[in-house]
Interface confidence: medium
């Protein structure tokens, strides 16, 4: 019979013969022959292959380097790579999450509009009139000025975007 020029899915052509690919999690040890099947071996402890393949070496699992602020989000298997994420307070610099940068803190006069996640930074917003923030925080929103009126007091010192109003007693009219 004519030697094949193309093979089925999950097969590969070698020496004019169709051999089975190794399944995910396994690497190729030897190609098939007229008399023997493809020989495959499982990947080692810290290795993986995530496709049907004819690779002779498995890939190393990604190392989540704590010195770069990384930690393991999902442990790798023989068929999947390790997924890294950043330590709390940090976010990935790229989709591949190869290193981390600090979540930004919002300075006094600014509040947190959106708390950071593992992939996005803190979003800060200026405190509008009537609100203030006197802290440097990655979590705190702008706080509303104290309402002196509800305490039966008057404003002695106006608030700013960084300071609360100062309330004081009302001047009493003498009889």
């Amino acid at each position: 019979p004519e030697p094949p020029t193309a093979c089925r899915e999950k097969q590969y052509l070698i020496n004019s013969q169709c051999c089975s690919l190794c399944q995910p999690g396994q690497k190729l040890v030897s190609d098939c022959t007229e008399f023997t099947e493809t020989e495959c071996l499982p990947c080692g402890e810290s290795e993986f292959l995530d496709t049907w393949n004819r690779e002779t070496h498995c890939h190393q699992h990604k190392y989540c380097d704590p010195n770069l602020g990384l930690r393991v989000q999902q442990k790798g298997t023989s068929e999947t790579d390790t997924i890294c994420t950043c330590e709390e307070g940090w976010h990935c610099t790229s989709e591949a999450c190869e290193s981390c940068v600090l979540h930004r803190s919002c300075s006094p006069g600014f509040g947190v509009k959106q708390i950071a996640t593992g992939v996005s930074d803190t979003i800060c917003e200026p405190c509008p009139v009537g609100f203030f923030s006197n802290v440097s925080s990655a979590f705190e929103k702008c706080h509303p000025w104290t309402s002196c009126e509800t305490k039966d007091l008057v404003v002695q010192q106006a608030g700013t975007n960084k300071t609360d109003v100062v309330c004081g007693p009302q001047d009493r009219l003498r009889a």
């Epitope: 010195n67 600090l102 803190s105 006094p108 006197n134 802290v135 925080s137 979590f139």
Partner: nanobody
Framework: EVQLLESGGGLVQPGGSLRLSCAAS????????MKWVRQAPGKGLEWVST????????YYADSVKGRFTISRDNSKNTLYLQMNSLRAEDTAVYYC???????????WGQGTLVTVSS
């Protein structure tokens, strides 16, 4: 100069409790978020908990959630970590840190050693 002095560690039996303190000086404590991290023998640093500047937001590592409570007293410039239902795997040197801080962390106090053993 920023100074953080941790205390309160010691030897405790599994299931026991400890309260760690961190006395801060050299910076305006009340305007910064703070956190606790720990380092078990022969292991890397592990984040434990974070508290926002006012104390209204708290965050915990899954390994300590429901057992540890972070708190602060801004009038005393002190950070606390109440540790309950302690386990052998909580054995570590515990450090407090001002947040944010560059990675790798560039400042540490001497830490306080917590040993959980029967």
């Amino acid at each position: 100069e920023v100074q953080l002095l941790e205390s309160g560690g010691g030897l405790v039996q599994p299931g026991g409790s400890l309260r760690l303190s961190c006395a801060a000086s050299g910076f305006t404590f009340g305007i910064y978020d703070m956190k606790w991290v720990r380092q078990a023998p022969g292991k890397g640093l592990e984040w434990v908990s974070t508290i926002s500047s006012s104390g209204t937001h708290t965050y915990y590592a899954d390994s300590v959630k429901g057992r540890f409570t972070i708190s602060r007293d801004n009038s005393k410039n002190t950070l606390y970590l109440q540790m309950n239902s302690l386990r052998a795997e909580d054995t570590a040197v515990y450090y407090c840190a001002k947040y944010p801080q560059p990675y790798p962390f560039d400042y540490w106090g001497q830490g306080t050693l917590v040993t959980v053993s029967s």
